[in-house]
């Protein structure tokens, strides 16, 4: 679809005569009829197959035709067509004299024709005007012409329809040849596909408008290149969505069980050595001088009452020191400066000299004791209660109040320790006088069968594709650390065949 445009510029009829030679009275009031048709080697009368147009009276005899395209579209003359421009044409331009106002052919006398020109040839679509001048014996016509495409039509023959748009159906403008030119941020045959944010993951991300990156289910991050771990995953990561692969030192389905309590919590105090002993449990090995589950209690060397003869004990950095009462000396106040002459024995005790009178010893009557028979007999002084039992004086006798888990006159017997199933990994528990004993199954050792003896689960080389094999001490089984590009418990699957998920 396009328009053949004809711009009339100047017509000269100096003598003011018709084609017959007869002069016009009072002058030739001139208008033009234009016929556009298909190419003919010899232009002949007949239908104007490409269109025709007439002008009003433009002047008398000789005149210049002004450009009137802005004031009504009469010059240039427009001959629109709605077919593919063939590139060739025939053009007939007739100048007529109008004696009155009616310009219809049937209203004109047959000899009102002033002049007639006919041309034919090739004409390519383009913006440039072709200038031409046709002269006869009495007249001269100067004009120019061109073919341009209608709005939204493009190409060498105006056959390509292209209407720029910026909506759901496309985002483009039209190039001179009619091809689409996508607006910035759009691509595809009809420029309907937005160009996502640079770096947005091809599979895991998408966009509905340019420079956007929306994530598909299971993916997150600005570029949708981070998988979302399984809901509830605590100390784990993923390589594909909804996984939970535990970080070092964590276990359980949701990686919420601390397999490395020692490192994560440092529970052992005072330089003690910490050993992990399973999920959320540990054992502290105390340095000398410390006790308690976490080695948090300092052992006092005075707890054993080393000072004799009423000496008082003081704890020191490097041990203890006895402050002796008057008349005694020595590391433990064990030596006396008194003799029998000083009557040192109380409560009827009898004195015996020793070391040629340098020291003495008291023989005490019943119910009294002490180096000077100064103390009433306390039946609890010998610490007869075992296992931390509390000794209670009951007149001439005594009794032991036992700590939970112990029984017997002296708290010497354990209540069955095996009731708590203390032996790990299927160990068999035996109650003994001194406590309990675990008989461990093959592959385990330690007081509670908590130590797994090393089993090389990797001996059979179970891992494929040059994977590194580790023995998992918590299960006696192998764990394959896959090289890049392989997955599976034995690294047997290439990543190109990813596991599929039920959802």
């Amino acid at each position: 679809s396009g328009v053949f445009q004809l711009q009339l510029q100047e017509f000269v009829n100096e003598r003011g005569v018709l084609a017959s030679g007869r002069p016009c009275e009072p002058g030739c009031r001139t208008f033009f009829r234009v016929c556009l048709k298909h190419f003919q080697a010899v232009v002949s009368p007949g239908p104007c197959t490409f269109g025709s147009v007439s002008t009003p009276v433009l002047g008398t005899n000789s005149f210049a035709v002004r450009d009137d395209s802005s004031g009504g579209g009469r010059n240039p003359l427009q001959l629109p067509f709605n077919f593919t421009w063939p590139g060739t044409f025939s053009l007939i331009i007739e100048a007529w004299h109008a004696p009155g106002d009616d310009l219809r052919p049937e209203a004109l006398p047959p000899d009102a024709l002033i002049s007639k020109i006919a041309i034919q040839g090739s004409l390519a679509v383009g913006q440039n005007w072709l200038l031409d001048e046709q002269t006869s014996t009495l007249t001269r016509l100067r004009y120019s012409y061109r073919v341009i495409c209608s709005d939204n039509y493009y190409g060498d023959n105006c056959s390509r329809l292209c209407k720029k748009r910026n909506d759901h159906f496309g985002h483009y403008v039209c190039q001179p040849d009619g091809n689409l030119s996508c607006l910035p941020g759009w691509t595809g045959e009809y420029c309907q596909q937005p160009i996502c944010l640079s770096g947005c993951h091809e599979q895991n991300g998408y966009c509905s408008k340019p420079a956007e990156c929306l994530c598909r289910p299971g993916w997150q991050g600005r570029l949708c290149n981070e998988c979302i771990p399984h809901n509830g995953c605590r100390h784990g990561t993923c390589s594909t969505p909804w996984q939970c692969t535990c970080d070092e030192g964590w276990g359980g389905l949701f990686c919420d069980q601390d397999l490395n309590y020692c490192t994560h919590h440092s529970p052992c105090k005072n330089g003690a050595t910490c050993s992990n002993s399973g999920q959320r449990s540990y054992t502290c090995t105390c340095r000398p001088g410390y006790t308690g589950v976490d080695c948090e209690l300092e052992l006092s060397e005075c707890d054993s009452n080393p000072c004799r003869n009423g000496g008082s004990c003081k704890d020191q950095e490097d041990g203890y020191h006895c402050l002796c009462p008057p008349g005694y000396y020595g590391l433990h106040c064990e030596h006396s400066t008194l003799s029998c002459a000083d009557s040192p024995c109380f409560n009827g005790g009898s004195c015996r000299e020793r070391n040629q009178g340098a020291s003495y010893a008291c023989e005490c009557p019943p119910n009294f004791t002490g180096s000077n028979c100064e103390k009433k007999v306390d039946r609890c002084t010998s610490n007869p209660c075992a296992n931390g039992g509390q000794c209670l004086n009951r007149g001439p006798s005594r009794m032991c109040r036992c700590r939970p888990g112990f029984t017997g006159t002296y708290c010497e017997r354990h209540v069955s320790d095996c009731a708590r199933n203390p032996c790990a990994h299927g160990g068999t528990c035996h109650d003994l006088e001194s406590g309990l004993m675990c008989t461990c199954p093959a592959g385990f050792s330690g007081r509670r069968c908590e130590v797994r003896t090393s089993i090389d689960a990797c001996a059979s080389s179970p891992c494929f594709n040059r994977a590194t094999c580790y023995t998992d001490l918590s299960t006696d089984t192998f764990v394959c650390n896959c090289p890049y590009g392989f997955v599976g418990s034995r690294c047997e699957f290439p990543v190109g065949l990813p596991p599929s998920f039920p959802w």
């Epitope: 399984h230 995953c233 784990g236 909804w242 996984q243 939970c244 692969t245 535990c246 964590w250 276990g251 359980g252 389905l253 949701f254 990686c255 990994h425 998992d472 918590s474 299960t475 006696d476 089984t477 192998f478 764990v479 394959c480 997955v487 599976g488 418990s489 034995r490 596991p499 998920f501």
Partner: nanobody, 120 residues
């Protein structure tokens, strides 16, 4: 293709029992630990038990200790969750999962789940 299919869920009265099964396919069953977790509406999932590939090591969440037992039959490629003394708070969708390794460390594949409702 790895597949885990749970079955055995249903409606049970408080104090009652149910036995869930998890049938596995698409991988070497003996090589993988298998576990159970559950998710109640509006709550985070809770790992409740896991059994190592050999069956030698089983752990349980404190909330189910003494009531639930997990076992595996490697010949049938199936793991079981025996649930006794059920309580209303045990109501959830129960899922079977595997970390894709021998030890109970994480989740790699999950089943579709089976609904357990404890109500009088």
């Amino acid at each position: 293709e790895v597949q885990l299919v749970e079955s055995g869920g249903g409606l049970v009265q408080p104090g009652g029992s149910l036995r869930l099964s998890c049938a596995a396919s698409g991988f070497t069953f003996d090589d993988y630990a298998i576990g159970w977790f559950r998710q109640a509406p509006g709550k985070e999932p809770e790992g409740i038990s896991c059994i190592s590939s050999s069956g030698g090591i089983t752990y349980y969440a404190d909330s189910v200790k003494g009531r639930f037992t997990t076992s595996r039959d490697n010949a049938k490629n199936t793991v079981y969750l025996q649930m006794n003394s059920l309580k209303p708070e045990d109501t959830a969708v129960y899922y079977c999962a595997t970390p894709g390794i021998a030890a109970c460390r994480g989740i790699h594949y999950t089943g579709q789940g089976t609904q357990v409702t404890v109500s009088s």
